[in-house]
């Protein structure tokens, strides 16, 4: 194959998107790389240029269209090679087939809001963005809260077993700053896996009512 | 008993196709990843292909150059190797092999990670 280890990922967002990351030990960071997407069904094909991540890892998005265009469906195999540059000439560094609807991962929820706030508690809804029609209501989420004095790591996860893109936030503490994260997976795909989280939506609960007396 | 059965070798000219089999029994098939390698005489055993458990990824050798496709039917637990434009280099025993750990599909496995092949089947590409 290649010499040190090599590793090539990619996944789909399910539209007009595959993200890929290539990373080899022992590699040139200013090595000029490549992706080459070539679906076996299409007359399209698409490449993006690999740029550096990290020491060893390169990074970049075929754009297949615009972005809520589909591009691929559930029976397409898109063949990505990486190409690296040797002098005048380039290098196939890897081979890989490639199942769009087996390696999903859609982009983070988006327009998140509140949509009534009380003392203990807060509803919140939100969108999916860019996600195939295809997958209906064959969707899950998970959702969660940051609390005051903890972080994003403790919040413990809310899991919507559903397409719901709403939730109701129960037995939160009155006159409190939080801040609300959620995540879209569907549920088909053998390599499928969570989108990035959210941007962190800001809310802040109800003061609690005065007493009568006070 | 374990048993993985390839078929579909043959002589063939220059330019052919020709697609390998391999059959298994005695294993839950769904759950292993497979591979194809070869072995050419006087040479060491070569990696050709391999696909994961549920077929969404499947790495290549470079040296197939996008002329072999590998893919399997769990419904029929079998998975297929079918090379395009042979080329007399592609003169080998071609071998499957079944892999109990997880594959990720997402780097080059060595033949150590296998742990079931089977007999293999001669592939002749005459010019």
């Known amino acids: 194959a290649v010499n040190g280890t090599s590793q090539f990922t990619c996944f789909y967002n399910s539209r007009a998107n595959i993200s890929c990351v290539w990373s080899q030990d022992g590699a040139l960071q200013d090595t000029s790389c490549q992706v080459h997407a070539w679906p076996d069904r299409r007359r399209w094909n698409q490449t993006c240029e690999l740029l550096p991540v990290s020491q060893a890892s390169w990074a970049c998005n075929l754009i297949l269209g615009a972005p809520d265009s589909q591009k691929l469906t559930t029976v397409d195999i898109v063949t990505l090679r990486v190409l690296c540059r040797e002098g005048v000439r380039w290098r196939v560094m890897a081979i890989q087939d490639f199942k769009p609807f087996e390696n999903l991962r859609l982009m983070a929820p988006i327009s998140l809001q509140v949509v009534h706030v009380e003392t203990h508690r807060c509803n919140i809804s939100w969108e999916i963005s860019q996600a195939s029609h295809y997958f209906e209501r064959h969707l899950e989420f998970e959702a969660r809260t940051l609390s005051p004095g903890h972080t994003w790591e403790e919040a413990p996860l809310l899991t919507l077993k559903q397409k719901q893109e709403w939730i109701c936030l129960e037995t939160l503490t009155p006159d409190t700053q939080y801040e609300f994260q959620v995540r879209v997976k569907p549920l088909q795909g053998e390599f499928t896996t969570w989108s990035p989280w959210s941007q962190p939506l800001a809310f802040r609960t109800k003061p609690a009512a005065l007493g009568k007396d006070t | 008993q374990v048993q993985l059965v390839e078929s579909g070798g043959g002589l063939v000219q220059a330019g052919d196709s020709l697609r390998l089999s391999c059959a298994t029994s005695?294993?839950?098939?769904?759950?292993?990843?497979l591979g194809w390698f070869r072995q050419a005489p006087g040479k060491k055993r070569e990696f050709v292909a391999a696909?994961?458990?549920?077929?969404?990824?499947?790495m290549y050798a470079v040296s197939t150059e996008g002329r072999f496709t590998c893919s399997r039917d769990n419904d029929k637990n079998t998975v297929y190797l079918l090379m395009n434009s042979l080329k007399p280099k592609d003169t080998a025993v071609y071998y499957c092999?079944?892999?109990?750990?997880?594959?990720?599909?997402?780097?080059?496995?060595?033949?150590?990670?296998?742990?079931?092949w089977g007999q293999g089947t001669q592939v002749t590409v005459s010019s």
């Open positions: 092999a079944a892999m109990t750990s997880y594959y990720s599909g997402t780097y080059y496995p060595d033949s150590s990670d296998f742990d079931i």
């Open positions: 005695g294993l839950t098939f769904s759950s292993y990843a």
């Open positions: 696909t994961t458990r549920g077929g969404g990824r499947t």
